[in-house]
């Protein structure tokens, strides 16, 4: 299908050539800021809360060209940031905890295998 | 436990308050800038492919201060944007198609019990 | 300051081959439209073809189509033009010129490279 | 595909002479209309885009105007490195097309 969109190219109106490779741009894989849900992101037990109870931080996110391909990051940071822990019931107030959070600094869309192989290395590590 | 936090305040350090502040208002709920796959928006034929296979629009995201909330529009506009609409096989190259996508404008969070509601209501016109 | 310098010309025979490059400097590659615009000896100017370096798409004048290709290196900020079964009547000064990018309808070339002859004789 | 006519093909004129070339498109191009002036052996030179904005770094001298079909491309007074040739462009539709040309010379 990439090569269908390489050769039909006749009479179409520049306007709208201009406004769908925008969305290309706009929709492309690259970190995106998103708000995470820290009780989900780290499997923390039911009576635990925290407040705020998500934090915002990048992730890789977007679309890439082709059903066979995902968007996956290839550099990432630690960001620590640090929130309020309620434990519930109530024994204490709630208690500021740091708390180390994955930021994407950078993405690729990569074939599906690539990102098994990938994932499976970290795992055998 | 929203009086506590306000209350235990008073004896944590500013820059905690500030930074903790600020995460509150980067993750709270908003319309946010998202990528939306245009097949799956709207279930078109296995055969149909678009290019770009998504587009850039608003949709209500972030998080709510409590679990039984949901962050929800209020309100939408309609985008129309042109893509390049290709189906297989190729009787014809890629032609150019305008679909108008949800584009939310303003959101809030709702009890679980609201959006249910409102969704059924929607319905039922 | 923005400049476009093409290379590749030459003279080759009826059904060969040529690639042209276009290397790119002074602006974001990727933040503009590239095109290839030919003019044949004592003639005016033909628009040959378009590549968003961005986003890979490309689009031909249908005097070409299946015989050129563009194409776009973007670690290399640089176009390419390959021509395959070349023809006498592909005889010009090839450029390579930029979108100008303004919010209107239309494109129009801002910056245009020196131009690089290619002959088609045998 | 979308003919541009130009007209004329060439002219004669002398220094501080007000010149017009009109350019007619064979449909609806709405503004997307560029003009070029091209000298012997150089690249053609952006002048005015989308119908009526100046390039910037050109003269005020030049203007351009019009919309739809009919396109008029005016230097208020004519200068000594203005003499070169000059073509129109439209870019409404893909491909983009040029007219063939109007040659501008010292009479």
């Known amino acids: 299908t990439e090569e269908t969109i390489k050769f039909a190219a006749a009479h179409y109106n520049t306007e709208i050539l201009k406004s769908i490779d925008n969305e290309w741009r706009k929709t492309q894989c690259m970190p995106r800021e998103v708000c995470i849900d820290v009780g989900k992101e780290f499997g923390v037990a039911t009576n635990t809360f925290f407040k705020p109870p998500c934090v915002s931080v990048y992730r890789c996110g977007g679309c890439c060209n082709s059903e066979g391909l995902q968007c996956m990051n290839t550099s990432t940071s630690y960001l620590s940031k640090t929130l309020f822990e309620i434990t519930v019931p109530l024994s204490q107030g709630p208690k500021p905890v740091t708390i180390s959070f994955a930021n994407h600094t950078s993405c690729r869309c990569m074939s599906k295998l690539d990102v098994y192989r990938q994932v499976h290395s970290i795992i055998r590590r | 436990t929203e009086e506590t936090i306000k209350f235990a305040a008073a004896h944590y350090n500013t820059e905690i308050l500030k930074s903790i502040d600020n995460e509150w208002r980067k993750t709270q709920c908003m319309p946010r800038e998202v990528c939306i796959d245009v097949g799956k928006e709207f279930g078109v034929a296995t055969n149909t492919f678009f290019k770009p296979p998504c587009v850039s629009v608003y949709r209500c995201g972030g998080c709510c201060n409590s679990e039984g909330l949901q962050c929800m529009n209020t309100s939408t506009s309609y985008l129309s944007k042109t893509l390049f609409e290709i189906t297989v096989p190729l009787s014809q190259g890629p032609k150019p198609v305008t679909i108008s996508f949800a584009n939310h404008t303003s959101c809030r969070c709702m009890s679980k019990l609201d959006v249910y509601r409102q969704v059924h209501s929607i319905i039922r016109r | 300051e923005v400049q476009l310098v093409e290379s590749g010309g030459g003279l080759v025979q009826p059904g060969g081959s040529l690639r042209l490059s276009c290397a790119a400097s002074g602006f974001t590659f990727t933040d503009n439209w590239i095109h290839w615009v030919r003019q044949a000896p004592g003639k005016g100017l033909e628009w040959v073809g378009v590549?968003?370096?961005?986003?890979?798409?490309?689009y031909y004048a249908d005097s070409v189509k299946g015989r050129f290709t563009i194409s776009a290196d973007t670690s290399k900020n640089t176009a390419y033009l390959q021509m395959n079964s070349l023809r006498a009547e592909d005889t010009a000064v090839y450029y390579c010129?930029?979108?100008?990018?303004?919010?209107?309808?239309?494109?129009?070339?801002?910056?245009w490279g020196q131009g690089t002859l290619v002959t088609v004789s045998s | 595909d979308i003919q541009m006519t130009q007209s004329p093909s060439s002219l004669s004129a002398s220094v501080g002479d007000r010149v017009t070339i009109t350019c007619r498109a064979s449909q609806d191009v709405s503004t997307a209309v560029a003009w070029y002036q091209q000298k012997p052996g150089k690249a053609p030179k952006l002048l005015i885009y989308s119908a009526s904005f100046l390039y910037s770094g050109v003269p005020s001298r030049f203007s351009g105007s019009g919309s739809g079909t009919d396109f008029t491309l005016t230097i208020s007074s004519l200068q000594p490195e203005d003499f070169a040739t000059y073509y129109c462009q439209q870019s409404y539709t893909t491909p983009p097309t040029f007219g063939q040309g109007t040659k501008v010379e010292i009479k």
């Open positions: 010129a930029r979108d100008a990018d303004y919010d209107y309808a239309g494109w129009a070339f801002d910056y």
């Open positions: 590549i968003s370096p961005y986003s890979g798409a490309t």
